[in-house]
């Protein structure tokens, strides 16, 4: 807290400009009018204030707006945004995408801070859903943003927004998140033809059910092994050897290198060994010829 002292004669700030750079903290406190600061916030960004001086300027705004800053001030906070706490930001009502962009720009190149996370949360809640423009903006600044949301939060993403998602935006998503995103992507891309559809849907396939994988296997898609390894194990297990061969096309040879890893390992255990042998890859661990396979889960369901 800066001690309150009268502003020295001739030092009262008439505008926010370079002359304030060498003011001491108490001089800034005494000589800069908070209302003037609020109307000229855009100038603060261009002036090399120290972090100590920025603390004083923030304090002045806090006193002027105890209930939270108006958006006209928030939009021009610039580097002063880095001084805000999540508690400060929770008082704000940010509705303009331009304001969001301006503040994200200040934090550009850094990890998502608690301040930024709170800002985004406030913005999205205010909008009611994660629309395409917002998602475009957020993933441009934070490619991993989508995967930081809970499945519940992802459920508010409209299918139209899925067009903004790039493959790298899904790199850190877990199966629960892809379970929510996949149906939206399927809906968003439903009018595309086979090969174009597969290119777009590929990065969402970690959420695809068995029946959709079976359908893809009939379309000569040539899925690469990296995508196959990200598929849900429970969706892969029911696929036949022939279906997997069609799904992977020339990439089927890659199964040998992955035979000890999920989901390939678990899938092999469910296949007849003689069916696996037809691939000519030397895959081992299938069900020996002559053995009967009982699906106990099906039996329990019937009883």
């Amino acid at each position: 807290e800066v001690e309150k002292t009268a502003c020295p004669s001739g030092k009262k700030a008439r505008e926010i400009d370079e002359s304030l750079i060498f003011y001491k903290k108490w001089e800034l406190e005494a000589c800069v009018d908070a209302a003037l600061l609020a109307t000229q916030m855009d100038r603060v960004n261009a002036i090399p204030f120290t972090y100590e001086q920025l603390d004083v300027l923030k304090h002045k705004l806090d006193e002027l707006y105890p209930q939270g800053y108006p958006e006209s001030v928030i939009q021009h906070l610039g580097y002063l945004f880095l001084k805000m706490s999540p508690e400060d930001i929770r008082k704000w009502n940010v509705t303009s995408l331009e304001t969001l962009k301006a503040l994200l720009e200040v934090n550009k190149g850094h990890e998502m801070s608690p301040q930024v996370a709170t800002l985004i949360d406030r913005f999205v809640k205010g909008r009611g859903q994660l629309d395409k423009d917002t998602l475009d903006t957020l993933t441009a600044f934070y490619p991993g943003y989508l995967c930081s949301l809970s499945p519940e939060e992802l459920s508010s993403v409209p299918p139209s927004s899925i067009w903004a998602v790039r493959p790298q935006d899904l790199d850190t998503c877990d199966p629960r998140q892809l379970d929510v995103l996949y149906p939206k992507a399927r809906l968003a891309f439903q009018n595309m033809n086979g090969s174009e559809y597969f290119v777009k849907i590929q990065s969402f396939l970690g959420g695809a059910p068995t029946e959709d994988l079976k359908a893809l296997s009939q379309q000569n898609v040539s899925m690469d092994l990296a995508t196959f390894m990200k598929l849900r194990t429970d969706a892969v297990l029911p696929l036949t050897v022939a279906e997997v061969q069609k799904l992977l096309g020339p990439h089927v040879e890659g199964l040998k290198a992955e035979e000890r890893h999920r989901p390939v390992r678990d899938w092999i255990l469910r296949q007849r060994q003689d069916d696996l042998d037809t691939l000519g890859l030397g895959l081992q661990g299938g069900i020996p010829n002559g053995y009967l396979v009982l699906d106990l889960s099906m039996q329990e369901a019937l009883s």
């Epitope: 001739g10 002359s19 060498f22 003011y23 960004n45 002036i47 090399p48 100590e52």
Partner: antibody, heavy 119, light 106 residues
Framework: EFQLQQSGPELVKPGASVKISCKAS????????MNWVKQTNGKSLEWIGI????????SYNQKFKGKATLTVDQSSSTAYMQLNSLTSEDSAVYYC????????????WGQGTTLTVSS | QIVLTQSPAIMSASPGEKVTMTCSAS?????MYWYQQKPGSSPRLLIY???NLASGVPVRFSGSGSGTSYSLTISRMEAEDAATYYC?????????FGSGTELEIK
């Protein structure tokens, strides 16, 4: 121990440009503003400008606007001053100087870089 | 911009003698700063905020003043104090320095 280490002497031709460096050590580079000062003939000192290493924002003495450009590289804790369109009037010793807490004077100075502009 | 006039321009003092030099500002300033510079060396901060001694500066140095009139005093001159002394203000933008007082040892 705090230190501001400047680049060595420069001999350049009129019309050319030069970039002087000032490497900071012993303190958090981004916490303190950096200034540049010109000294001609071992006499008067003139303030050129100031830069905030945290945000890269800068301010210049009107006299040096268009002549000097201040930049920083946070990764190497180094401040730079580029001087362009050099003339013999620019021949001087140039210092970088850190501003102390709450604007308590230029508390640490570099050793100075001698610039000679001559054809 | 504020002009700082230092006087005298050159002075000499004997070891042990009290030395006072002044800095007059063309307009009122809040604080004055004083620097010492020896030949071939960088300036060194002596006094900040008019009267505060910078780190490592001997207590024989002191500063005072207000408004447009400031002074630097050395209570007892020592040989190592031979140097040029500059006053500086940044109450008004841009910061400016005085033209210096050259102090010699007798």
């Amino acid at each position: 121990e705090f230190q501001l280490q400047q680049s060595g002497p420069e001999l350049v031709k009129p019309g050319a440009s030069v970039k002087i460096s000032c490497k900071a050590s012993g303190y958090s580079f981004t916490d303190y503003n950096m200034n540049w000062v010109k000294q001609t003939n071992g006499k008067s000192l003139e303030w050129i400008g100031i830069i905030n290493p945290n945000y890269g924002t800068s301010s210049y003495n009107q006299k040096f606007k268009g002549k000097a450009t201040l930049t920083v590289d946070q990764s190497s804790s180094t401040a730079y001053m580029q001087l362009n369109s050099l003339t013999s009037e620019d021949s001087a010793v140039y210092y970088c100087a850190r501003v102390g807490r709450d604007n308590s004077g230029f508390d640490y100075w570099g050793q100075g870089t001698t610039l000679t502009v001559s054809s | 911009q504020i002009v700082l006039t230092q006087s005298p321009a050159i002075m000499s003092a004997s070891p042990g003698e009290k030395v006072t030099m002044t800095c007059s500002a063309s307009s009122s300033v809040s604080y004055m700063y004083w620097y010492q510079q020896k030949p071939g060396s960088s300036p060194r901060l002596l006094i900040y905020d008019t009267s505060n001694l910078a780190s490592g500066v001997p207590v024989r140095f002191s500063g005072s003043g207000s408004g447009t009139s400031y002074s630097l005093t050395i209570s007892r001159m020592e040989a190592e104090d031979a140097a040029t002394y500059y006053c500086q203000q940044w109450s008004s933008y841009p910061p400016t320095f005085g033209s210096g007082t050259e102090l010699e040892i007798k």
